[in-house]
Amino acid sequence: FPQTTEKISPNWESGINVDLAISTRQYHLQQLFYRYGENNSLSVEGFRKLLQNIGIDKIKRIHIHHDHDHHSDHEHHSDHERHSDHEHHSEHEHHSDHDHHSHHNHAASGKNKRKALCPDHDSDSSGKDPRNSQGKGAHRPEHASGRRNVKDSVSASEVTSTVYNTVSEGTHFLETIETPRPGKLFPKDVSSSTPPSVTSKSRVSRLAGRKTNESVSEPRKGFMYSRNTNENPQECFNASKLLTSHGMGIQVPLNATEFNYLCPAIINQIDARSCLIHTSEKKAEIPPKTYSLQIAW
């Protein structure tokens, strides 16, 4: 049967390919739970770390500068970019029906939690997404520390602040700065960028079972680790690519159910810093060692 579908409502059609939407959502959930899962579930602490790393764990003070100073004195610890050292997928792209780009074989471990990371619009605790795959993996850090020399000062007691510097018309540079906290961990073995080997183990959850594909040597748990410089970061998907990768048409409005399919990809993209570029110091027009926002939408 053809894959495209149409909504049964007057003057409304939708090109959603539900098979692709489900598989792609599962893929992104798998990435997130691989990074933040613990014992095959997303603990409150793991969930807290995810929120922390996507920058919504606490109120942040934002400063927007309208002077055109192109060389603010920003410093980052580039060793601790917020990228996973084993979860990069530059080819994870699909087009409307099934353009066959590989996801790569990133096997993750886990059982099934009932709830997707994006909440339902109309559902109880049973959850929306039966495909959430959880697993083990090291956590993505905030930047270890940073100094800033900006006109509007921020209270030294504030743990995290977000600073926008207007570098040129319509362009902003985002830096999230976090003072180091006691007890931050630096895992010893974080250099491997290869996916886990496929070794079958079995686990059972309340409602279903997952036989896990685990690696023999997984990245040790920790909040911070560095990324290999030769890795390709996950591609920054704009709106069209997000839709087509989930088998959705780009010319029609999204309803809540369709948007729900996109939630894990959006979170994964934020968490992986897919749309931030660690710019070269050679580029005079851009402040050194600054994460710039790609024009993705």
Epitope: V18, I22, S23, Q26, H98, H100, H103, S126, G127, S205
Partner: antibody, heavy 113, light 107 residues
Framework: QVQLVQSGGGVVQPGRSLRLSCTVS????????IHWVRQSPGKGLEWLGV???????DYNAAFISRLTISKDNSKSTVYFQMNSLQAEDTAIYYC???????WGQGTLVTVSS | EIVMTQSPATLSVSPGERATVSCKAS??????VVWYQQKPGQSPRALIH???YRYSGVPDRFSGSGSGTDFTLTISSLQSEDFAVYFC?????????FGQGTKVEIK
């Protein structure tokens, strides 16, 4: 054209294992998950499990102890193995892509001595 | 597991008439429901997904509605080729579960 072609099945003795194959064309196993469902007169349609794009598997808890789903992406083939079959496992077994659109032709498995 | 209960088990309808099949979930499944048609000796054919989306190629006399726990498949004007067994399935929670089927037969 999307197709799922199943092979294997037939008569299996009680206590023995069943191995089925599902070879797909028209799409990639790195893009879509493949589900297994069975249908019997007594129990109707039962979802058994799925293998996702990255190789992870989710199983119906009722079958996890004796079910293994694997795949070979290069061969575009998914493998289904169920151990310790009993008479009540007699059914038509289907592979399917996603919860909906494309199903294999089904293969009848009869567990009998 | 979520139990999907279909009613009626058998529906006797004359050609040209409307047929309505009901499916009730034992807990909220949002709109994660698909409807299948199955004819003897054939694999199930998906008609509707996400409770109310019709696959292209499926005649517009088939429609689906509902969310949460109550779902309905409606065939507005039965044609001879529509006499078959219809199943609902939820894919909100593991294990994905099916209704027991509703046989739509000629009256």
């Amino acid at each position: 054209q999307v197709q799922l072609v199943q092979s294997g099945g037939g008569v299996v003795q009680p206590g023995r294992s069943l191995r089925l194959s599902c070879t797909v064309s028209g799409f990639s196993l790195t893009t879509y998950g493949i589900h297994w469902v069975r249908q019997s007169p007594g129990k109707g349609l039962e979802w058994l499990g799925v293998i996702w794009t990255g190789g992870t598997t989710d199983y119906n808890a009722a079958f996890i102890s004796r079910l293994t789903i694997s795949k070979d992406n290069s061969k575009s083939t998914v493998y289904f193995q169920m151990n310790s079959l009993q008479a009540e496992d007699t059914a038509i077994y289907y592979c399917a892509r996603g919860p909906s659109s494309y199903w294999g032709q089904g293969t009848l498995v009869t567990v009998s001595s | 597991e979520i139990v999907m209960t279909q009613s009626p088990a058998t529906l006797s309808v004359s050609p040209g008439e409307r047929a309505t099949v009901s499916c009730k979930a034992s807990q909220n499944v949002d709109t994660n429901v698909v409807w299948y048609q199955q004819k003897p000796g054939q694999s199930p054919r998906a008609l509707i997904h996400s409770a109310s989306y019709r696959y292209s190629g499926v005649p517009d006399r088939f429609s689906g509605s509902g969310s949460g726990t109550d779902f309905t498949l409606t065939i507005s004007s039965l044609q001879s080729e529509d006499f078959a067994v219809y199943f609902c399935q939820q894919y909100n929670n593991y294990p994905w579960t099916f209704g027991q089927g509703t046989k739509v037969e000629i009256k």
